[in-house]
Interface confidence: low
C-alpha cells in the first residue's frame, strides 16, 4: 500500500475511563498532512462522528470510555504529497480497582504512573492528562492509599501535586482524580501512580541528564560514515537502561537484517558524585531513508534525538 | 538565578586568620557542591577545598592543615577559615558552584571574588 | 597531584586567526574543563566534559582531547576573546588548574 511502517507504541490503559491517543510524529506531522486512524488492520477509518464512544478528533483517537473489547493495534495512517507514514498503536485495555489491596500493582507500568519524590526537598508529582481540546478537564482531586490528601505539606497547582519537606511516609499508592467533560456528557479520569523516595540529592536528583545530543540536527552528506555520541550524567547508583532508538525500537532491533546502523558499546567514567555515560551510534552507510528522521538516545525517563539532514547545496 | 556573594576583611595581619562568608541565592546549599578557590595576583587558579551538601569537606592538601570551611544552612551561606596567614595568601578569594547541565564538577556560578591582602 | 601545563603561556595573535591552546597532564585525566578570565572578573566556564560549550559561549570555540593532552580552538579569533584561559581537571584530588594562557592582540 506504499506506506512506510513506523514504530509500534504499546499503552496500558485502564478500562471504564476516557483515553485519547495523539499520532504525532516530527517532522512528518509539521507539514500538511492528512491524519486517518484504522482499528486493528480494517480498511473503515474510525468514525469521526463525535457522538461515537470512539471517534477521531483531529488527529487524536478518542475512547469515550476505554472497554474491554478495545484492547487491539491501531494504526494511524500520516499521509502527504508525495508520502505516507503509518504508526502502529498496541493498545492493552486492563482493569484495575485503585482501592482493591488484593491487586498487585500493575503490569508494565509507564514512567508516567511510576514516580519518585527527593527525601527532605520540596518536590512534585504530575497527573498526566493527554487529551485533545474537545476535552475540558476540571480540577485535579488528589487521593493517597484511596484517602483524598488534606494537610499544609500539600499543594495542588494545575496538573501537579506539590509536597513540601518530603518524608519516608510520602511513599505509596496515589491516584489523581479529574472529570472530563465533552459534548455535555461526564466522565471520571482516575490514574494511580506509585511513588518512591529517594535520598539523592544533588543537581540532577535522580533524573539523568543528556547533555549531547540537544534535539538537534546534524548536516552529513548521503553515503558517509557518522559516529555519534550520546553523553548523559546519571546517579552512581542509577538502574537506567541507556540506548539508541528509533521509531520506539531498539536500533539493533530496527536494523537487524542489515546492521547498517548499531549501537555502540556504553563506556562510564565516575566523577565525585555522578557517573557519565557514552554510548555511540553508528551509521556504516548514510541513506536517503535516514534524513529527517529522529534517532532517540534514551536514558531512564530522559530522551533526545538527533536528525540527520542533507547539508545545503554549495553555489559557489 | 543562583547568585554568589564573598563578604570578609580585604586586609589581614601575617599570623591571623582571614575569614570570608559566601552568601548563596537562587539556590539552597543543602544540595551540590560549595567551592573556594583562589587567584594570586599576577598568577593563576588554586582550588582550596568544598563542603558538599551533606556537610562533607574537602581540603586541597596544600593548604589542609591551615582551612577551615563550614556552613550555616539557615543563613544559606558557607564560609572559609585560612589560619597563620602569609604574604602568599595575598589572593583574590572567589567561591563557586556547579550544577550546569547537572555536571556539579563544572564550576558555572562565581562570586565577583574579594580582594584579601596580608599585610602588616 | 596531576601537574597541568599550558602552552603557549602568552600567545599574540590578530582578529580571524585560528588559535589552539594546550593543556597537558602529569597523569591521565577523564575530562577537561576550561574557564575565560577577563581582568578583574571572576573566570567563567567556558568548556565542560572536555568538548561541551557552556552557555553563550560562541561556536567558533571548541575543546577536544583525551587522556593526558587536550586543545581549546578558536577557528577564528574575535576581539572578545581576548582573555586569559584556564583548564583544570576534576579527576584526582587535588583538583589542578593550568598555570593559564594570556591571549592578546597583535
Known amino acids: 500500500d506504499g506506506c512506510n511502517d513506523i514504530f509500534m507504541k504499546n499503552e496500558m490503559l485502564s478500562a471504564s475511563q476516557p483515553f485519547a491517543f495523539n499520532c504525532t510524529f516530527p517532522p512528518i506531522t509539521s507539514g500538511e498532512v492528512s491524519v486517518t486512524w484504522y482499528k486493528n488492520s480494517s480498511k473503515i477509518p474510525v468514525s469521526k462522528i463525535i457522538q461515537s464512544r470512539i471517534h477521531q478528533d483531529e488527529t487524536w483517537i478518542l475512547f469515550l470510555p476505554m472497554e474491554w473489547g478495545d484492547s487491539g493495534v491501531y494504526q494511524c495512517v500520516i499521509k502527504g504529497r508525495d508520502s505516507c507514514h503509518r504508526i502502529h498503536v498496541n493498545l492493552t485495555v486492563f482493569e484495575k480497582q485503585w482501592c482493591d489491596t488484593s491487586v498487585k500493582g500493575l503490569p508494565n507500568l509507564s514512567d508516567e504512573y511510576k514516580q519518585i519524590l527527593h527525601l527532605g526537598k520540596d518536590d512534585s508529582l504530575t497527573c498526566h492528562l493527554h487529551f485533545p481540546k474537545s476535552c475540558i478537564l476540571g480540577p485535579i482531586k488528589w487521593y493517597k492509599d484511596c484517602n483524598e490528601i488534606t494537610g499544609e505539606r500539600f499543594t495542588v497547582l494545575e496538573t501537579r501535586l506539590l509536597v513540601s519537606n518530603v518524608s519516608a511516609e510520602d511513599r505509596g499508592n496515589y491516584a489523581c482524580q479529574v472529570i472530563l467533560t465533552h459534548s455535555g456528557k461526564q466522565y471520571e479520569v482516575l490514574n494511580g501512580i506509585t511513588v518512591s523516595i529517594t535520598e539523592r540529592a544533588g543537581y540532577g536528583g535522580s533524573v539523568p541528564k543528556i547533555i549531547y545530543p540537544k534535539n538537534n540536527s546534524i548536516e552529513v552528506q548521503l553515503g558517509t560514515t557518522l559516529i555519534v555520541d550520546c553523553n548523559i550524567t546519571d546517579t552512581k547508583d542509577n538502574t537506567n537502561l541507556r540506548c539508541w532508538r528509533v521509531n520506539n525500537t531498539l536500533v539493533d532491533d530496527y536494523y537487524n537484517e542489515s546492521k547498517r546502523i548499531r549501537e555502540g558499546v556504553e563506556t562510564h567514567a565516575s566523577f565525585r558524585e555522578y557517573n557519565l555515560y557514552t554510548v555511540n551510534i553508528t551509521f556504516l552507510e548514510v541513506k536517503m531513508e535516514d534524513y529527517g528522521l529522529p534517532f532517540m538516545c534514551h536514558a531512564g525517563v530522559s530522551a533526545a534525538y538527533i536528525m540527520l539532514q542533507l547539508p545545503a547545496p554549495d553555489f559557489r | 538565578q543562583v547568585q554568589l556573594q564573598e563578604s570578609g576583611p580585604g586586609l589581614v595581619k601575617p599570623s591571623q586568620t582571614l575569614s570570608l562568608t559566601c552568601t548563596v541565592s537562587?539556590?539552597?546549599?543543602?544540595?551540590g557542591y560549595w567551592n573556594w578557590i583562589r587567584n594570586h595576583p599576577g598568577k593563576g587558579l588554586e582550588y582550596i577545598?568544598?563542603?558538599?551538601?551533606?556537610?562533607?569537606?574537602y581540603y586541597n592538601p596544600s593548604l589542609k592543615s591551615r582551612v577551615t570551611i563550614s556552613r550555616d544552612t539557615s543563613k544559606n551561606q558557607y564560609y572559609l577559615k585560612l589560619s597563620s596567614v602569609t604574604a602568599a595568601d595575598t589572593a583574590v578569594y572567589y567561591c563557586?558552584?556547579?550544577?550546569?547541565?547537572?555536571?556539579?564538577?563544572?564550576?558555572?556560578?562565581w562570586g565577583q571574588g574579594t580582594l584579601v591582602t596580608v599585610s602588616s | 597531584d596531576i601537574q597541568m601545563t599550558q602552552s603557549p603561556s602568552s600567545l599574540s595573535a590578530s582578529v580571524g586567526d585560528r588559535v589552539t591552546i594546550t593543556c597537558r597532564a602529569s597523569?591521565?585525566?577523564?575530562?577537561m574543563y576550561w574557564y575565560q578570565q577577563k581582568p578583574g572578573k571572576a573566570p567563567k566556564l567556558w568548556i565542560y566534559?572536555?568538548?561541551n560549550l557552556a552557555s553563550g559561549v560562541p561556536s567558533r570555540f571548541s575543546g577536544s582531547g583525551s587522556g593526558t593532552s587536550y586543545t581549546l580552538t578558536i577557528s577564528s579569533l574575535q576581539p572578545e576573546d581576548f582573555a586569559t584561559y584556564y583548564c583544570?581537571?576534576?579527576?584526582?584530588?587535588?583538583?589542578?588548574f593550568g598555570q593559564g594562557t594570556k591571549l592578546e592582540i597583535k
Open positions: 563557586a558552584t556547579g550544577g550546569y547541565d547537572y555536571v556539579e564538577d563544572a564550576l558555572y556560578y
Open positions: 537562587g539556590a539552597s546549599i543543602t544540595s
Open positions: 577545598g568544598y563542603i558538599y551538601y551533606s556537610g562533607y569537606t
Open positions: 597523569s591521565n585525566v577523564r575530562y
Open positions: 566534559l572536555t568538548s
Open positions: 583544570q581537571q576534576f579527576t584526582t584530588s587535588p583538583y589542578t
